[in-house]
């Protein structure tokens, strides 16, 4: 039987069950390498609290439809009368990297994952030549996730004094040209995450190969290597790699760009301080507030929630959103669909999109950026759910009693975009980190 | 105050049964995973079973197939149904409740001998 998602198949991949301290390690293609979990497993669960192994999914009873894999295993569970087997779930959504398999809940007899990654897609518009894993788990089992940086077009420009040569990189997937073909990075080769331009010419000095690495509990590190065998002529004999480390700073601040701090022989060390290598309950919340001891911050944007079935309108040129943002609260427009964001078509108003759902909801502030995000809307013809981005400002005269009001600026493959300037927006900063 | 107590535990004969009680207090008992040890005389603590908050469990090879953990959230108790009983298995028996937000608590624990 074929590997159902091949692109996932080179890596084991974690996850993890905050609430009970367990750590899961997936392959899906082949087996884990964790002799306590036998030589089959493909899902195996470390218990920390107990320092055992169980393996709760093998990689001989797997079925895979397109969107759905399933690990059985022969070891029976306790469901009274019956004779169930312990298994795991993982559902495949569209994404647009890699992502991670996030656990989602475990019953007596199933343990239940969620990933959205490019290799759930119907169409290949997302998918990178090369991506690896972009996120860690630190000691403490906190989660350290950089996907948010990866560009799916064009590069970042590292921060370097020379002035004959710039460096542009990726996070964990090569340089995407063909999308965002800017002047500099066109003639960067295919499959390079970190391009030297020097006038008109570009080299490739790195490809991704491994995923990303935690080497103490602030300081993550991504290395580049070029692959194939011909060495460029201005690295004296030497194969150029190029180690990105991220550096999660000690307290909060704005976002910085990546620095160059070392260049020898074409081995490029970069250093990035960027709060996206913290880990994500310091960035993150589920609710409209980030506030407490975790995140050294008071943000709550719980006051713009609408009630009495009004919503925001913003206009998009073809068609209208209508948003309600931090609430439970139906768009009337929008037939049930439990959306936060609510496209309507200005031509055909029965034509009707959730853009991004109520429940599916993350408030992120990291490098100085306040967003809220909403995925899990209506598909696109992709396979990839719709999702809206609001950008939040500061703006303590805003109007509409300070709650001021969303204006959307674009769509970028089902990824709707939306700037909101209002005085809730408006962050208080504590000290001790 | 938070505490965990034991009950349940005694004499019984190769082969036979007891139920274990751990009634907790002073937690939200439904977001705690809770895990049964148990220690031999002379020997190390061991692991005997664990049942997360979610509802999954696990159990020592040991005790595969002739122990059962259990929970009635409405009675803030945990048990463990010990059946096919050995002599190996006489041990002081604890409980454990363990979430994100507490420190692990554990009981005084509760004796079992199994002995004809």
């Known amino acids: 039987q074929a590997a159902p998602f091949p692109e996932l198949c080179s890596y084991t991949w974690e996850a993890v069950d905050t609430k009970n301290n367990v750590l899961y390690k997936i392959n899906i293609c082949g087996s884990v390498d964790i002799v306590q979990c036998g030589p089959s497993s493909a899902v195996c669960m470390h218990d920390l609290k107990t320092r055992t192994y169980h393996s709760v999914g093998d990689s001989v009873l797997r079925s895979a439809t397109r969107s759905l894999l399933e690990f059985n295993t022969t070891v029976s569970c306790d469901q009274q009368g019956t004779n169930h087997r312990v298994q795991s779930s993982i559902a495949f959504l569209c994404g647009k990297t890699l992502g991670t398999p996030e656990f989602v809940t475990a019953t007596e007899c199933v343990h239940y994952f969620e990933w959205r990654t490019t290799a759930a897609c119907k169409k290949d518009i997302f998918k990178a030549n090369k991506e690896v894993p972009c996120y860690v788990f630190d000691e403490e089992l906190r989660k350290h996730d950089l996907n948010p940086l990866i560009k799916l077009s064009g590069a970042y420009l590292v921060d370097d004094s020379d002035p004959d040569t710039s460096l542009f990189i990726n996070v964990c997937r090569d340089i995407d040209t063909l999308r965002d073909p800017g002047s500099q990075l066109r003639a960067c080769p295919p499959g390079t995450a970190a391009c030297l331009v020097r006038g008109h010419q570009a080299f490739d000095v790195g490809q991704p190969r491994d995923g990303l690495k935690v080497v103490r509990k602030d300081r993550l590190v991504l290395s580049y290597v070029r692959e194939e065998a011909g060495k460029l002529d201005f690295c004296d004999g030497h194969s150029p790699a190029v180690t990105i480390t991220f550096v999660c700073p000690s307290e909060r601040r704005e976002g910085t760009i990546p620095k160059l701090t070392a260049k020898s022989n074409c081995r490029y060390e970069i250093e990035w301080i960027t709060e996206y290598a913290c880990h994500r309950d310091y960035l993150e919340s589920k609710t409209c507030s980030l506030s407490g001891e975790q995140q050294d911050v008071s943000i709550d944007l719980t006051p713009l929630a609408q009630s009495g079935g009004s919503s925001y309108i913003s206009d998009g040129k073809e068609y209208l959103f209508y948003l309600n943002v931090c609430g439970e609260t139906e768009i009337q427009f929008c037939n049930k669909k439990q959306a936060a964001v609510c496209q309507v078509k200005k031509s055909d108003t029965s034509q009707v999109k959730a853009a991004g759902r109520y429940h599916n909801q993350t408030l992120r502030y990291s490098d100085g950026d306040l967003t809220l995000i909403y995925f899990g809307g209506d598909e696109c013809s992709s396979g990839f759910q719709r999702m809206s981005v609001i950008n939040f400002e500061c703006n303590k005269t805003a109007g509409n009693d300070g709650k001021g009001t969303p204006v959307f600026t674009g769509e970028v493959d089902c990824t709707y975009e939306f700037t909101w300037d209002t005085e809730y927006a408006c962050v208080h900063h504590h000290h001790h980190h | 105050d938070v505490q965990l107590v034991e009950s349940g535990g005694g004499l019984v004969q190769p082969g036979g049964s007891l139920r274990l009680s751990c009634a907790a207090s002073?937690?939200?008992?439904?977001?705690?995973?809770m895990d049964w040890y148990r220690q031999a005389p002379g020997k190390q603590r061991e692991w005997v079973a664990t049942?997360?908050?979610?509802?999954?469990?696990t159990y020592a090879d040991s005790v595969k197939g002739r122990f059962t953990i259990s929970r009635d959230n409405a009675k803030n108790t945990v048990y463990l149904q010990m059946n096919s009983l050995r002599p190996e298995d006489t041990a002081v028996y604890y409980c454990?409740?363990?979430?994100?937000?507490?420190?692990?608590?554990w009981g005084q624990g509760t004796l079992v001998t199994v002995s004809s």
């Open positions: 454990k409740a363990s979430s994100p937000v507490l420190n692990d608590i």
């Open positions: 002073g937690i939200i008992f439904s977001d705690n995973r």
């Open positions: 049942l997360a908050s979610y509802g999954w469990k």
